[in-house]
């Protein structure tokens, strides 16, 4: 009886694992083996595919074959018993195009209200992704084990910290990789769970902000308790993108080591141009807090994010505020080539009760004012990029009196 060729050959490539699967054409024939040949583009001869010769099952692995993953390859298969079937040719394919990204490795560390997630490519030193190692981004799904309500976090890198969690709570998450340059989305990792710790005695510092004064950076933060010492560390932001490296060499800012105030001042030349992460830790001599949330600090934006300049036109029941570009020394306006949002704070001169307006426009109306009353206004600019989240310092306050009661038109 003539052997029939196998059919429905599927090629599965996940990272550097090359798997072939096929259907037997004739289930009634026993003791049949299968063999594959391959052919590279531009070659006439067929070569035996190592790892896929005389296979008794309907699956084989040819990962050991050292292929150029960007080069097209053709496969053929036949069945063998006493005689052989005709060859069945598989559509040619390029391994890189066909490859899927495998599940990443995930390593979790817990604090009281945060989880640190370290993500590594599933295949170390992968040949398939050798040119794309730094292009991987990851997304994750996280949920409280008790509730199951999922939160998705997109576009993260090989180290990510999730804050504002509950102490003594089990969180579960799964992660997948993506190569956006090649339109590839990977498969999810297994689910990993970790329990946050009991609440720490000392909370971390909060609301860290950087501003520029003269030739210095001023770093400020809030803290719950008095009589503390603080230290500040920095890290190049690009280091979070380094795949497989999970040793982050945070560096001290010398002028911000063991400071006793909730701010420190250090020269701008401490940092070369670039994007950095900053974090602050508190200590009372016996206990130490966990590190604060890490803030992103871009020297380029920080250096030029100056407080806005504005003019006020006073009416009886409102101010019209016109925001202009800030002035450098020499009175030349600064070109801000990134979108800004403006925070305007105003208050009655005789009162401490502040009101706030957030506005994207550069002309703003401050409504509901009393006639013939002195109001003070100050403003600052924020970048609209959530990741950079930079703010200028507030402008100096400008105080103006509203007009008498009949000039609102």
């Amino acid at each position: 009886k003539n052997l029939k060729s196998p059919q429905k050959v599927e090629v599965d490539i996940i990272d550097d694992n090359f798997i072939l699967r096929w259907n037997r054409s004739d289930e009634s024939v026993g003791n049949v083996t299968f063999s594959f040949d391959y052919q590279k583009t531009g070659m006439d001869n067929w070569i035996k595919l190592s790892g896929c010769q005389n296979i008794t099952s309907t699956k084989c692995n040819f990962s050991s074959l050292k292929l150029n993953v960007y080069e097209e390859i053709k496969l053929r298969i036949r069945a063998e018993k006493e005689n052989t079937s005709s060859w069945y040719e598989v559509d040619s394919f390029t391994p890189f195009r066909k490859a899927q990204i495998g599940p990443p490795e995930v390593h979790l560390e817990a604090e009281d209200k945060a989880i640190v997630i370290h993500i590594s490519p599933g295949t170390k030193d992968s040949v398939m992704w050798a040119l794309d190692g730094l292009s991987f981004t990851y997304s994750l799904v996280i949920w409280k084990n008790s509730s199951g309500v999922e939160e998705r976090i997109e576009n993260i890198y090989s180290r990510h910290k999730i804050y504002k969690l509950s102490p003594e709570t089990t969180y579960c998450l799964k992660v997948k990789a993506a190569l956006l340059t090649s339109w590839k989305i990977g498969v999810y990792s297994p689910v990993h769970c970790i329990k946050t710790t009991v609440e720490n005695e000392l909370p971390p510092p909060e609301n860290i902000e950087v501003s520029v004064q003269n030739q210095n950076y001023v770093l400020k933060w809030d803290y719950t308790y008095a009589n503390m010492t603080f230290q500040v560390q920095w890290l190049h932001a690009f280091l979070k993108r380094n795949p497989g490296n999970h040793l982050y060499k945070w560096k001290q800012i010398p002028d911000c080591e063991n400071v006793k105030t909730t701010q420190c001042v250090f020269p701008q030349n401490v940092f070369q141009k670039g994007i950095y992460l900053l974090r602050v830790q508190a200590s009372d001599g016996n206990n130490t807090s966990f590190w604060s949330e890490e803030i992103k600090f871009d020297t380029e934006i920080q250096a030029f994010l100056l407080p806005p300049v504005f003019n006020i036109r006073s009416l009886s029941d409102s101010f019209h505020i016109y925001i202009g570009a800030p002035k450098q020394s020499g009175n030349t306006p600064v070109i801000q080539d990134y979108p800004l949002i403006y925070e305007i704070i105003f208050w009655e001169n005789t009162s401490n009760a502040e009101r706030k307006i957030i506005e994207k426009k550069t002309d703003v109306t401050v409504p509901n004012l009393k006639p013939l009353t002195v109001y003070c206004v100050k403003a600052r600019a924020h970048t609209m990029d959530e990741k950079l989240n930079k703010s200028s310092v507030f402008s100096d306050a400008v105080c103006e009196k509203t007009k008498p009661g009949n000039t609102s038109k």
Epitope: A110, T197, K251, F290
Partner: antibody, heavy 118, light 107 residues
Framework: QVQLVQSGAEVVKPGASVKVSCKGS????????MHWVKQAPGQGLEWIGR????????KYAPKFQGRVTITADTSTSTVYLELSSLRSEDTAVYYC???????????WGQGTLVTVSS | DIQLTQSPSFLSASVGDRVTITCKAS??????VVWYQQKPGKAPKLLIY???YRVSGVPSRFSGSGSGTEFTLTISSLQPEDFATYYC?????????FGQGTKLEIK
Amino acid sequence: QVQLVQSGAEVVKPGASVKVSCKGSGFNIKDYYMHWVKQAPGQGLEWIGRIDPEDAETKYAPKFQGRVTITADTSTSTVYLELSSLRSEDTAVYYCARGGNFYVMDYWGQGTLVTVSS
Amino acid sequence: DIQLTQSPSFLSASVGDRVTITCKASQNVGTNVVWYQQKPGKAPKLLIYSASYRVSGVPSRFSGSGSGTEFTLTISSLQPEDFATYYCQQKNNYPYTFGQGTKLEIK
């Protein structure tokens, strides 16, 4: 493969100094931290300090601050521990260890016995 | 400095026994705890890091757990080669500190 090879045993007099070396191979020491750990005879482990060979930044345990100096020579992939004003309680085995991913001391040298004796 | 207290300091057990060593930290260290095994005349060997992650090549009978201030190392079924001294260490804050050690002896 990763290896840390330390210099040989030393016998030194009280008040003197000693410099122990640790040569790394199979990895680039600039990509890691390098730690030193003390173990007195029959005692437990004590962390002395560490260096970042990339920029020579050091951290020391307060107990050892001032009497020990950790240095690195990246051209020879070697780190050093110098102990000064030696006393009998400095008699111990000194280990170097590599600080790798997740800040873990993952590979250790074979240890160097320093004996302080008159 | 963060103190780590191991208990017991000495432990006698037999091959096949399940043993647990505990390590208590004087303050919350998250999951930043490491376990080492040391045999006489040898350097310490890393077993467990980040409280519960077993190092590649370490037998599955070794496991770690805990977070905050309380951590445990468990050996599910003692083998002859497991008799040694075990140390916990915190890597949450400088200076790094070790527990005083637990010497595991054959009963």
